[in-house]
Amino acid sequence: MNGRVDYLVTEEEINLTRGPSGLGFNIVGGTDQQYVSNDSGIYVSRIKENGAAALDGRLQEGDKILSVNGQDLKNLLHQDAVDLFRNAGYAVSLRVQHRLQVQNGPIGHRGEGDPSG
């Protein structure tokens, strides 16, 4: 019997300092460019090697960005979201949602050392 794939969703506040080449990541999404089905949210599509986000290490490709400097990213056109990042200033606070894939074991399976039974 196959295991079930679940997702562990966590939120994190990430404070980035704009580096010499900017924040160092790309985004997809928006009300006019849905990248995830039935979700117009803004997602990280690429992290630039040695950019500010990469050097910080917490932001990951696939993360959903919920807000920038406290401004909600819901219901934004794609380009409006891009402009928000580009004009966000030197110190940028991101509220992000990480979605971690969790592989559960097969149903009915008990691992070694399971105290029950």
Partner: nanobody, 127 residues
Framework: DVQLVESGGGLVQAGGSLRLSCAAS????????MGWFHQAPGKEREFVAE????????GYTDSVKGRFTISRDNAKNTVYLQMNSLKPEDTAVYYC?????????????????????WGQGTQVTVS
């Protein structure tokens, strides 16, 4: 992934025009930011122009502003670079490039590190 093939290069006299094309194969073309770079002999590859996935936003390096125009046709999976008032210093190999999503940094910072997919290049010579 996306594959890119440039065309339209050639030999042109100073003051003349050329239109470069870049045909892309692959899915979700409108999710890709597209750019043009050029590389002169003995020099590094340099940013020329960029266009967002929907075509609503463009950026240019200072030396081509007012002379070059980047555009795209998402129905044809193609990006174009219209080059007018060409100068001898525009002589280079021109490369089409693509990256998924939109950079959150302005084109003032753009470099080849910002792009993941590249064409084979097309030679432009201005005499």
């Amino acid at each position: 992934d996306v594959q890119l093939v440039e065309s339209g290069g050639g030999l042109v006299q100073a003051g003349g025009s050329l239109r470069l094309s870049c045909a892309a194969s692959g899915r979700a073309f409108s999710s890709y930011t597209m750019g043009w770079f050029h590389q002169a002999p003995g020099k590094e590859r340099e940013f020329v122009a960029e266009i967002s996935g929907t075509g609503g936003n463009t950026g240019y390096t200072d030396s081509v502003k007012g002379r070059f125009t980047i555009s795209r046709d998402n129905a044809k999976n193609t990006v174009y670079l219209q080059m007018n008032s060409l100068k001898p210093e525009d002589t280079a190999v021109y490369y089409c490039a693509a990256v998924i999503g939109s950079p959150t940094d302005s084109t003032d910072y753009r470099s080849s590190l910002d792009y993941d997919y590249w064409g084979q290049g097309t030679q432009v010579t201005v005499s």
